[in-house]
Interface confidence: medium
């Protein structure tokens, strides 16, 4: 056999050994078929290979595992459980692999797993115990620090007869396993609302991305417990106004940066408090870019340039004078 190509530290199919005699020492770690492996970088890439299951012969040294662009469909319990365990696996990327079901305990026996990316999978069925591994009221803490769940909403016709937001939140909160989570990305999921208890139970969050959803209001969402929060992405939602309670909570977070671009702000009398706050606060990034969407007469006006005289509400007519 020929020597491995020296062009890169990744190898995948070039022979590893110059000869093939019986006296060779055994190779404890093979590279799975259809994957590329770099022991030096502790990385395995099985990318865009139409794999229908997780390879069973993953090398024990793997620290970074990319299984993107495949056709995995289902992640069963113990999908990564091995004997001996994959004790060093710290970063697992499963994005774009056509997963529609992640079962309870799918990520069990990964004691070092810190980063998990399930983005761009149509998760019609995400088990409440996908991340906690058990249905105990208090589970063993998950080692996860980053959980990336961007664009995991399935097509309309594949959703179960239940709230998608509720399904995701149930998985995030089960067994209080994700108390150590620092980054949570939930962008592009058509979320209409954020269940009120979700943030209170993720006290370690530093970064929360809820951009490109359909959030209309944050009225019932409390940020009070998120004392470590550094970035909150709310761009490209359907927010009309932020009310006093929310403004005060955000202002009270010591390290926060909030991103509010591309929301359809309604510049009427209810916007007065938010405009006042925007003029004073340092927490909103790009606040000079925020513009009104409604009413029509206010469209494209910059929020920071408004004054109280601009922010009026049409008087509510008594029923006798209302027209259909």
């Amino acid at each position: 056999s020929s020597p491995t190509s020296s062009a890169s530290s990744f190898s995948s199919s070039a022979p590893f050994l110059a000869s093939a005699v019986s006296a060779q020492p055994p190779l404890p770690d093979q590279c799975p078929a259809l994957c590329e492996c770099s022991e030096a970088a502790r990385t395995v890439k099985c990318v865009n290979r139409n794999l229908t299951e997780v390879p069973t012969d993953l090398p024990a040294y793997v620290r970074n595992l990319f299984l993107t662009g495949n056709q995995l469909a289902v992640l069963p319990a113990g999908a990564f459980a091995r004997r001996p365990p994959l004790a060093e696996l710290a970063a697992l990327n499963l994005s774009g692999s056509r997963l529609d079901e992640v079962r309870a305990g799918a990520f069990e026996h990964l004691p070092s797993l810190r980063q998990l990316d399930l983005s761009h999978n149509p998760l019609a069925d995400l088990s409440p115990f996908a991340f906690s591994g058990s249905n105990a009221s208090v589970s063993a803490p998950s080692p996860l620090v980053e959980l990336i769940l961007n664009h995991i909403v399935p097509p309309e016709d594949e959703r179960q007869n239940r709230s998608f937001e509720g399904m995701v939140v149930a998985a995030l909160l089960a067994g209080r396993a994700l108390q150590g989570l620092r980054r949570l990305e939930l962008a592009s999921n058509h979320f209409l609302y954020l269940p009120r208890d979700v943030l209170a139970q993720l006290p370690s969050l530093r970064h929360l991305d809820l951009s490109n959803n359909s959030l209309v209001s944050l009225t019932y969402v409390s940020f009070r417990n998120l004392t470590h929060l550094e970035s909150l992405h709310l761009e490209d939602n359907a927010l009309k106004v932020l009310h006093n309670g929310t403004l005060a909570e955000l202002q009270g977070l010591p390290h926060i940066r909030v991103f509010l671009d591309n929301n359809p702000w309604v510049c009427d009398c209810h916007m007065a408090d938010m405009v006042t706050w925007l003029k004073e606060t340092e927490v909103v990034q790009g606040k000079d870019r925020l513009t009104c969407a409604y009413p029509e007469k206010m469209r494209n006006r910059v929020l920071l340039e408004l004054n109280s005289a601009d922010l009026d509400c049409d008087p509510i007519l008594p029923p006798s004078l209302q027209t259909s």
Epitope: A7, S13, A20, V21, C31, N48, D57
Partner: antibody
Framework: EVQLVESGGGVVQPGRSLRLSCAAS????????MHWVRQAPGKGLEWVAY????????YYADSVKGRFTISRDNSKNTLYLQMNSLRAEDTAVYFC?????????????WGQGTTVTVSS | DIVMTQTPLSLSVTPGQPASISCRAS??????????MHWYQQKPGQPPQLLIY???NLESGVPDRFSGSGSGTDFTLKISRVEAEDVGVYYC?????????FGGGTKVEIK
């Protein structure tokens, strides 16, 4: 010297079974993934099945899935192909071939082949 | 499945002259690091023999008159100076995904 020697071929009726063997020598068999590839008379090569070094992963061509089973016995340095529900279109020379150690590139060593004829 | 299309079907070459065989995959069989394309020679009555792996790497023991090139979907096997012993059928094969598939083969004859 690396050697792969297939055996077990023969003439068999449609619907019956046959088990092919591939005896390996001259290298550490347990370190290598192994494949079966077949060649129908006068035709090109068709990949049939793959098994990883420790028998933890198997892959099959759609044409044989559910009928053929690949296995290996590392203590005997032998690769097997159990062929059930044989059809006329399974008639071919069957080669075993080795994947290079550690990474999967081309198939670097091949046996001489064993002939399977499915005929009534 | 990835379809491998080889051209020409057959090739008649004068000894000492070059020869070239093309193989086109129905989708890319290259990553940013490697091309998962290999070339085999099969002489009459013999099993195939690996000539080139990963598009351009010469297998040990193979004469250096053989060379391979290409990436993505288009690959080429070249013989710089054909010799009488080079007669046989040449196959390309990818190992990008399951199933591995082979080209239909190119028969090389000597004029």
């Amino acid at each position: 010297e690396v050697q792969l020697v297939e055996s077990g071929g023969g003439v068999v009726q449609p619907g019956r079974s046959l088990r092919l063997s591939c005896a390996a020598s001259g290298f550490t068999f347990s370190n290598f993934g192994m494949h079966w590839v077949r060649q129908a008379p006068g035709k090109g090569l068709e990949w049939v099945a793959y098994i990883s070094s420790g028998s933890s992963t198997f892959y099959y061509a759609d044409s044989v899935k559910g009928r053929f089973t690949i296995s290996r016995d590392n203590s005997k340095n032998t690769l097997y192909l159990q062929m059930n529900s044989l059809r006329a279109e399974d008639t071919a020379v069957y080669f075993c071939a080795r994947s290079p150690a550690y990474y999967r590139y081309g198939l670097d060593y091949w046996g001489q082949g064993t002939t399977v004829t499915v005929s009534s | 499945d990835i379809v491998m299309t080889q051209t020409p079907l057959s090739l008649s070459v004068t000894p000492g002259q070059p020869a070239s065989i093309s193989c086109r995959a129905s989708q890319s069989v290259s990553s940013s690091t490697f091309s998962y394309m290999h070339w085999y020679q099969q002489k009459p009555g013999q099993p195939p023999q690996l000539l080139i792996y990963s598009s351009s790497n010469l297998e040990s023991g193979v004469p250096d008159r053989f060379s391979g090139s290409g990436s993505g979907t288009d690959f080429t096997l070249k013989i710089s100076r054909v010799e009488a012993e080079d007669v046989g059928v040449y196959y390309c094969q990818h190992s990008w995904e399951i199933p591995y598939t082979f080209g239909g083969g190119t028969k090389v004859e000597i004029k």
